[in-house]
Each structure stands twice: as structure tokens, then as C-alpha cells.
Interface confidence: low
């Protein structure tokens, strides 16, 4: 058993056949010594008396809010949550496996630049009685500070018969060093509580591996005289790290016909312009990627040819 | 070339070669990004590699003030990785394919380190750790880790030379 926060405790249970469970001793936070009784949740049934209560926690029926009273007055509360290990594996029931980039990916994180700011998100089908708290650090043995905000509901989607809820959190490394080569990964830890179930999820990454630039901005076409060719130009996204002579991007320019089956013409360039042939009804798209490290491409920025 | 006393390197040549190194490092092991090598207990292997750290002066401001600190650190790393790529880890079984980019990568590391430091002038170089994996699978894992680490190192080096070529070239 360990303390999650004040008056909230997590009991780690092996969800095993005939497992004896965990013996837990609760102590009433009061100078009083006698006349103390204990109840669980909303029930008025007295579970025991005295300053301490010893219980055997085996299943969810044994978890909940234990309250000690004296003469009708509430003295203190202890909320017991269960963290269960089933068939040798800690349960991961609250969050949905996003399966990208690999199985058992519950948290996904992205950064728009090297400033030390990143966003993580996760999915669940649970709509009520759900709380999250997020902690992060750079490295684990001698952790350096990363400050995370509160997790918020960022999207709701309907998937077949189910509703899916996306939560996200923004974090910022306290003393980020954008130009350095990271040697210790960022660790992100999410505590999830659904009713009386506790679970924790972790992710470990280098900022360089989760970089995904915003799409190029101010995408423009300039027709070239007496030619089917156009000059496409664009700019670095505002959110990208500066100076651009140091934090450089590379770009992919694509000409795509109306039909998805039409052949795509692609050009790769380090410049912020390119000359391409603009076909009727086609569109021109440009995306960006870190020039020197193959992290994710940005989403496409697009303009129609006509 | 950098010369004793600390004049500028051939920024543009260094830029071209470091960008080529980035391309080679990724073609040597493109799928490495899909393996979470941190799960494989890499403390003893990649903790010893020279990293370009915050105080090494490789940021734009540090390069403007005095690029020598940063160039020395990059040189140190290039020699370190050049030795690793020429070691038993890469030359032993399982042998690399004949057209593997590792050979080119090895030669380019040496080329860039020589651009940074002419003969007869020696910066301190870091000792290469004695890594002698006993099993072929351990050697494979070590290769992945080294290439993964090299990708991060050469990315920073390439940024330094690109910025130097754009802003510090005479």
C-alpha cells in the first residue's frame, strides 16, 4: 500500500486464485483514543471500533472511502483504490491501446519544435468517474524538472457504437536546451483513476523522436510566363525553432490530381520554393520535416492549381 | 580546416559532409526508429558516448562567441564513432552486407574529422569503451544502439555546420 495523495491510498493486488489479498491497517487521524467507529462509503454498518481498523483487501468490494467517526462527527477519511495485477500483468483497462507506433502504446506525444514543450494525449471509452494526473521529468535516476498542466478533455469521437474520449496535456521542460543532443529521455507518468480502480501509464522518449513540425505557412503559387510550370513558395511555420539557419527543415512538394489513383509527382527540396507543373484540377501540397533527423513529417499544406 | 590557435574551419565543406553523414546514418539503419532500444538495458553501452551537451557552446550564441569549444566536442565525437564503426562490433559476425552504407559512413566520419583537425595538431580524444559482445545478437543490438546514437549526434553537428556556413563563413 502507498499514498497517492493526502488520504488516498493505492493497494496493489495480485488478482490471483485464492490470493489472500493485502492486510491494510487504517489509522484514524485524531487525538481521540476511544469511542471511535468505522464505516465504508455510504453504509452505516459499523465495520469496527478503535483508533485503528485492520482489513483484508481482496477485491473492489473492499475498496472505497473508509471513515472514522465519534459521536456522529466525522474525524477523518481514507480512500482505498485498487491497482490490480492480473495474470502477471498490471491492468490497463482505463486507456485504449492506440497501437501506433507499436502495440501497447497508451500515451502518444508530439512536439512542434525543440523548445522542450510537448503535448501528450490518450484515449478512453469511459465518460464518468474518471480522473488523471500527469508527472514528467528528464531522466529517472536524477530527474530534471518538467512541468505539466492539467489533463483536459480535448476531443470526443463516435467509433461504431462507442464514444471515444481524447484527453491531452501540455508539458514544458524547465531548463530546456534546444541545441543540445539529448542523452536522457523525457519520462511521462500518467495516473488514471476510474471509480476505485487505479492504473498508471508511462512513456519514455527523446524530444527529437517526437518532433512533428506544423505545416509550412503562406503557401503561394506564381505562374511562370509561357509555361505550364508554376513557382510554389512557402515559409517556415511560426512554431518552428529559430534561427532557421540552425534549425533547418526539408520539404516535400506534391502535385496530386483530383483522383486519388492519379500518379503523384513529388519533389524534395531544402529551399522554400520549387518549380512544378500544375495540372488542371490538381492541387499542390507541401509538408516539412527536420532536415537532419528523420522524425515525423508535418501535415500537408495545400493550394488548388487553378 | 581548423588550425591550432583556433581559426575557422571550412564551414561550407563541413556543412556538405555533415549533411551527407546524416543521410548515411539513417540509410545505415532506417528502421531503428521503430525499435525501443531503451528497453534493452543500454546503460553500459551508450552512456559512454560523447554527447553534445548544453555547455559545449554548440548553440547559435555559443558558436558566435567562440566556435572552438563546440568544434572540439564534435571532433571528439567523430573520432569516437569512427573507432566504433571500425571495431569488432561492426566488423564481426553477423557480417554487414557488401553494399551496406556503414563503410561509407565510417569513411565520411574520418573525412569530417580530418577537415576539422589537420595533421600535427591534436585535440584530446575520448577513450573508446571496451565493448566486446560475445553473441551475434548482442552485436546486432549494439550496432542499432550505436547508429541510433550517431543519428542524434550528427544531426546536431550538421546544424552547427549549416549555421556556421550561413553566418560565420568569411
Amino acid at each position: 500500500i502507498w499514498e497517492l495523495k493526502k488520504d488516498v491510498y493505492v493497494v496493489e493486488l495480485d488478482w490471483y486464485p485464492d490470493a489472500p489479498g493485502e492486510m491494510v491497517v487504517l489509522t484514524c487521524d485524531t487525538p481521540e483514543e476511544d469511542g471511535i467507529t468505522w464505516t465504508l462509503d455510504q453504509s452505516s454498518e459499523v465495520l469496527g471500533s478503535g483508533k485503528t481498523l485492520t482489513i483484508q483487501v481482496k477485491e473492489f468490494g473492499d475498496a472505497g472511502q473508509y471513515t472514522c467517526h465519534k459521536g456522529g462527527e466525522v474525524l477523518s477519511h481514507s480512500l482505498l483504490l485498487l491497482h490490480k495485477k492480473e495474470d502477471g500483468i498490471w491492468s490497463t483497462d482505463i486507456l485504449k491501446d492506440q497501437k501506433e507506433p507499436k502495440n501497447k502504446t497508451f500515451l502518444r506525444c508530439e512536439a512542434k519544435n525543440y523548445s522542450g514543450r510537448f503535448t501528450c494525449w490518450w484515449l478512453t471509452t469511459i465518460s464518468t468517474d474518471l480522473t488523471f494526473s500527469v508527472k514528467s521529468s528528464r531522466g529517472s535516476s536524477d530527474p530534471q524538472g518538467v512541468t505539466c498542466g492539467a489533463a483536459t478533455l480535448s476531443a470526443e469521437r463516435v467509433r461504431g457504437d462507442n464514444k471515444e474520449y481524447e484527453y491531452s496535456v501540455e508539458c514544458q521542460e524547465d531548463s530546456a536546451c534546444p541545441a543540445a543532443e539529448e542523452s536522457l529521455p523525457i519520462e511521462v507518468m500518467v495516473d488514471a483513476v476510474h471509480k476505485l480502480k487505479y492504473e498508471n501509464y508511462t512513456s519514455s522518449f527523446f524530444i527529437r523522436d517526437i518532433i512533428k513540425p506544423d505545416p509550412p505557412k503562406n503557401l503561394q503559387l506564381k505562374p511562370l510566363k509561357n509555361s505550364r510550370q508554376v513557382e510554389v513558395s512557402w515559409e517556415y511555420p511560426d512554431t518552428w525553432s529559430t534561427p532557421h539557419s540552425y534549425f533547418s527543415l526539408t520539404f516535400c512538394v506534391q502535385v496530386q490530381g483530383k483522383s486519388k489513383r492519379e500518379k503523384k509527382d513529388r519533389v524534395f527540396t531544402d529551399k522554400t520554393s520549387a518549380t512544378v507543373i500544375c495540372r488542371k484540377n490538381a492541387s499542390i501540397s507541401v509538408r516539412a520535416q527536420d532536415r537532419y533527423y528523420s522524425s515525423s513529417w508535418s501535415e500537408w499544406a495545400s493550394v488548388p492549381c487553378s | 580546416r581548423a588550425v591550432p590557435g583556433g581559426s575557422s574551419p571550412a564551414w561550407t565543406q563541413c556543412q556538405q559532409l555533415s549533411q551527407k553523414l546524416c543521410t548515411l546514418a539513417w540509410s545505415a539503419h532506417p528502421l531503428v526508429g521503430h525499435m525501443d532500444l531503451r528497453e534493452e538495458g543500454d546503460e553500459e553501452t551508450t552512456n559512454d558516448v560523447p554527447h553534445i551537451q548544453c555547455g559545449d557552446g554548440c548553440d547559435p550564441q555559443g558558436l558566435r562567441d567562440n566556435s572552438q569549444f563546440c568544434l572540439q566536442r564534435i571532433h571528439q565525437g567523430l573520432i569516437f564513432y569512427e573507432k566504433l564503426l571500425g571495431s569488432d562490433i561492426f566488423t564481426g559476425e553477423p557480417s554487414l552486407l557488401p553494399d551496406s552504407p556503414v563503410g561509407q559512413l565510417h569513411a565520411s566520419l574520418l573525412g569530417l574529422s580530418q577537415l576539422l583537425q589537420p595533421e600535427g595538431h591534436h585535440w584530446e580524444t575520448q577513450q573508446i569503451p571496451s565493448l566486446s559482445p560475445s553473441q551475434p545478437w548482442q552485436r546486432l543490438l549494439l550496432r542499432f544502439k550505436i547508429l541510433r546514437s550517431l543519428q542524434a549526434f550528427v544531426a546536431v553537428a550538421a546544424r552547427v555546420f549549416a549555421h556556421g556556413a550561413a553566418t560565420l563563413s568569411p
Partner: antibody
Framework: EFQLVQSGAEVKKPGASVKVSCKAS????????MNWVRQAPGQRLEWMGV????????TYNQKFKGRVTITVDTSASTAYMELSSLRSEDTAVYYC???????WGQGTLVTVSS | DIVMTQTPLSLPVTPGEPASISCRSS???????????LNWFLQKPGQSPQLLIY???TRASGVPDRFSGSGSGTDLTLKISRVEAEDVGVYYC?????????FGSGTKLEIK
């Protein structure tokens, strides 16, 4: 008393699907994962997958590459295992087993034959 | 997948004599929490498997104390101190340290 009661034997043609049920009683159905295991004649036991009845989350043995689907009907305290694209080598006894494998159903023989 | 190799394939024993079955795992089943995630089962002819031992060495309820489990993270052993006629059947080890859970090939215990 804990009990897992499975549906009766089935004979299927190659290419068909089979759905085996497992009705639980004597405990709170949603509190415990349900595993499915099969045993071909004279072969070792083979784990197929597991479901958490409370959330409907599943983990499958990749060997069955999308052929197996485990579901539950919590109102009926029943777990189901459906195996599609049946082949002769799927002839086996199929078992459901509660968390920790302490309690097993009696088994359902599925015969695949043309 | 973790491969479980069980020996012997067949084990003829005289009643009252001890018996030992070995199971080797291709990967350690010992977790950071100090527990070893291995089960032992007995499958009697025509019956479903029954759990004998879980967490490598803990006897399931109702299992006689002549059955014991021991081992390291990869080399596991089931011992029967004095074999009785009712102990005949096929014994299986099973790892539940990681998905997919896998079983050994089985050891058939017969009375001489």
C-alpha cells in the same frame, strides 16, 4: 460455488465459423478476466486470448491473426469465443478459464471436417 | 513468444516414490516484484486441467502438500514427494509473465 459451463460440441466445415459460449456463475462476472485455451488431440494446451468483461478489452495470441474474437454479454454473465475461417487443424477442445486459470469450463469439442 | 520446454515426456513412477518434472523457459519469468509467473497444471484423462501451483511455488487451494514448486527465473521444477495412484495424468507448466501465455508440451505421469 464457482462454475463455468460451456456450450455443446460442434461439427463445422472448413471455412466456416464457430462460436463457443461460457456461462459463469457463483462470482461477480465483471471482476475477473476470462481466458480461452484450446487443446488439439494429443497436443499441448494453447492460449488463444483474454477479455476483461468490465471494459471489453481484449488481448489475442497473434498466432490466430484476426481469426479469433472474444466478446462478453455481461447481463448474461457469458463469455464467447468465435473462431473464423476454420481449417482441419482447428479441431480441438476449447476451454474458457477464469483469471489465474484456477477455474476452467468443461471444454467444448469443435470438429472441423469436410 | 516465450518457449516452455518440459522434460521428461513420460514419467513412470512407483506409488510412494518421489517424482520430479522440469520446465525450462526461454526467458526469465522472474519479475521486478520478486515473483515468478509460472503455473503448474494436472490434466487427468477426460478432464479439464486443474491448477496445482501458481507463482512458481504457491499451492492452489485443496492441493495436497506433497506437491511443491521451486526454481529460478528460467529453470522450474514440480516435485511430488510421494506419488499416489490419483496423481496420474499429464502435467503442464505455463508462463504468464507476458502475452501470449504459453504452455509446456506436457509430462505424462504413469504408475509402474
Amino acid at each position: 460455488e464457482f462454475q463455468l459451463v460451456q456450450s455443446g460440441a460442434e461439427v463445422k466445415k472448413p471455412g466456416a465459423s464457430v462460436k463457443v459460449s461460457c456461462k459463469a456463475s457463483g462470482y461477480t462476472f465483471t471482476d475477473h478476466n476470462m481466458n480461452w485455451v484450446r487443446q488439439a488431440p494429443g497436443q499441448r494446451l494453447e492460449w488463444m486470448g483474454v477479455i476483461n468483461p468490465n471494459y471489453g478489452t481484449t488481448t489475442y495470441n497473434q498466432k490466430f491473426k484476426g481469426r479469433v474474437t472474444i466478446t462478453v454479454d455481461t447481463s448474461a454473465s457469458t463469455a464467447y469465443m468465435e473462431l473464423s475461417s476454420l481449417r482441419s487443424e482447428d479441431t480441438a477442445v476449447y476451454y474458457c478459464a477464469r483469471r489465474g486459470f484456477a477455474y476452467w469450463g468443461q471444454g467444448t469439442l469443435v470438429t472441423v471436417s469436410s | 513468444d516465450i518457449v516452455m520446454t518440459q522434460t521428461p515426456l513420460s514419467l513412470p513412477v512407483t506409488p510412494g516414490e518421489p517424482a520430479s518434472i522440469s520446465c525450462r523457459s526461454s526467458k526469465s519469468l522472474l519479475y521486478k516484484d520478486g515473483k515468478t509467473y509460472l503455473n503448474w497444471f494436472l490434466q487427468k484423462p477426460g478432464q479439464s486441467p486443474q491448477l496445482l501451483i501458481y507463482l512458481m511455488s504457491t499451492r492452489a487451494s485443496g492441493v495436497p502438500d506433497r506437491f511443491s514448486g521451486s526454481g529460478s527465473g528460467t529453470d522450474l521444477t514440480l516435485k511430488i514427494s510421494r506419488v499416489e495412484a490419483e496423481d496420474v495424468g499429464v502435467y503442464y507448466c505455463q508462463q504468464i509473465a507476458e502475452y501470449p501465455f504459453t504452455f509446456g508440451s506436457g509430462t505424462k505421469l504413469e504408475i509402474k
